[in-house]
């Protein structure tokens, strides 16, 4: 008789999840010599231990503590790039500007990027059918708790000048309900962070508006200023040219505004 299984509203665990996490860990430790000491089997065991046999609506930050410990690394605190609703460009940027880091350039972020996972209470099975949706089911699900935990700690680790890439094509360029707006902004440490610099990325070819004057950017500036952190904002009118100029800063066309 097939066992009754809880049906959740969200997609199930990404297929081949254990193999994917293990393979990503091996690849990351090969690419980053300073992480060669990491035992990827232990990393997988700690990852698995965070959610297997646990109710997928009852996950806590403490569940991820063993994984956090194994994922320890030296991320330069003054080279952190946060992003909101513009992940691809942020990652393209750090692939060129190799000394800067998004969360997904860390081991923990790299392991989990774009994956879904959950287990079931009292069984060692991974649920490949469905996982809790943050809105429709519960917020304390394995994926949401993971990202909230690492995002908070990434923001807490930041220092000096912190950059954030924001999507100028969205109706809310700064969204208080995004991970950046709800977690990272509030966990920047004023005693360590001097300035938050926002880069507003334009979408339209002929869009010459100053999106730094957008009401949601003004809202971000207000939140940041109240936390005794300076705020600055730059329009990136031509993201394609921006990336090209990061690759080739000597190019003569790179002296003009991008």
């Amino acid at each position: 008789v097939p066992r009754w299984r809880q049906q959740w509203s969200g997609p199930g665990t990404t297929k081949r999840f254990p193999e994917t996490v293990l393979a990503r860990c091996v690849k990351y430790t090969e690419i980053h010599p300073e992480m060669r000491h990491v035992d990827c089997q232990s990393v997988w065991d700690a990852f698995k231990g965070a959610f297997i046999s646990k109710h997928p609506c009852n996950i806590t930050e403490e569940d991820y503590q063993p994984l956090m410990k194994l994922g320890t690394q030296t991320v330069p605190c003054n080279k952190i790039l946060l992003w909101s609703r513009i992940k691809d460009l942020a990652h393209q940027f750090t692939q060129v500007q190799r000394d800067m880091f998004t969360l997904e350039d860390t081991l923990l972020g790299y392991l989990a990027d774009d994956l879904t996972w959950c287990g079931e209470f009292n069984t060692s099975k991974i649920n490949y059918q469905s996982c809790p949706d943050w809105r429709k089911d519960c917020s304390n699900n394995p994926v949401s708790v993971f990202w909230k935990t690492v995002s908070r700690r990434f923001a807490e680790a930041a220092c000096d000048v912190v950059h954030v890439m924001l999507n100028g094509s969205r109706s809310k360029i700064f969204d208080k309900n995004s991970t950046f707006g709800s977690v990272e902004v509030h966990n920047l440490q004023p005693e360590k962070v001097q300035t938050l610099e926002a880069w507003v990325i334009h979408g339209g070819r002929e869009d010459s508006r100053d999106l730094c004057q957008d009401p949601t950017i003004k809202e971000l500036e207000s939140i940041i200023s109240k936390r005794n952190i300076q705020f600055s904002c730059k329009n990136i009118y031509r993201p394609d040219k921006f990336l090209q100029c990061v690759k080739n800063p000597e190019d003569s066309s790179c002296t003009s505004e991008i």
């Epitope: 956090m68 410990k69 994922g71 320890t72 690394q73 030296t74 991320v75 330069p76 605190c77 003054n78 080279k79 860390t106 923990l108 935990t149 690492v150 700690r153 990434f154 807490e156 680790a157 220092c159 000096d160 000048v161 360590k192 001097q194």
Partner: nanobody
């Protein structure tokens, strides 16, 4: 992994000065926030001073105007200059670094004793 070793502590008269040093394995202070903590007898550790790679410094109220934190990346060393010392400054001084996501590294501590 990160290893921190403090030195420079000792016995000093009230009003005197000391310079504490914290040497790290690898050039950690070029990329990480570095903290100095003090633990007075029978008390928990308290944060005394912080310095970022960009040179941004913060001090506990009790340290302002008397203590100065600095780093020398070439020597992979952080310093805490203590001046106008009082008996209340007596304690074990520790340097500390926290690596992402949240692993703490501490030195073994160096004893500072201020006699009146």
């Amino acid at each position: 992994q990160v290893q921190l070793v403090e030195s420079g502590g000792g016995l000093v008269q009230a009003g005197g000065s000391l310079r504490l040093a914290c040497t790290a394995s690898g050039n950690i202070f070029a990329s990480q926030v570095m903290n100095w903590y003090r633990q007075a007898p029978g008390s928990p550790r308290e944060l005394v001073a912080t310095i970022t790679p960009g040179g941004r410094t913060t001090y506990a109220d009790s340290a302002k105007g008397r203590f100065t934190v600095a780093t020398d990346n070439a020597k992979a060393t952080a310093y805490l200059q203590l001046t106008s010392l009082t008996p209340e400054d007596t304690g074990v001084y520790y340097c500390h670094v926290r690596l992402f996501p949240a692993t703490d590294y501490w030195g073994q501590g160096t004893q500072v004793t201020v006699s009146s």
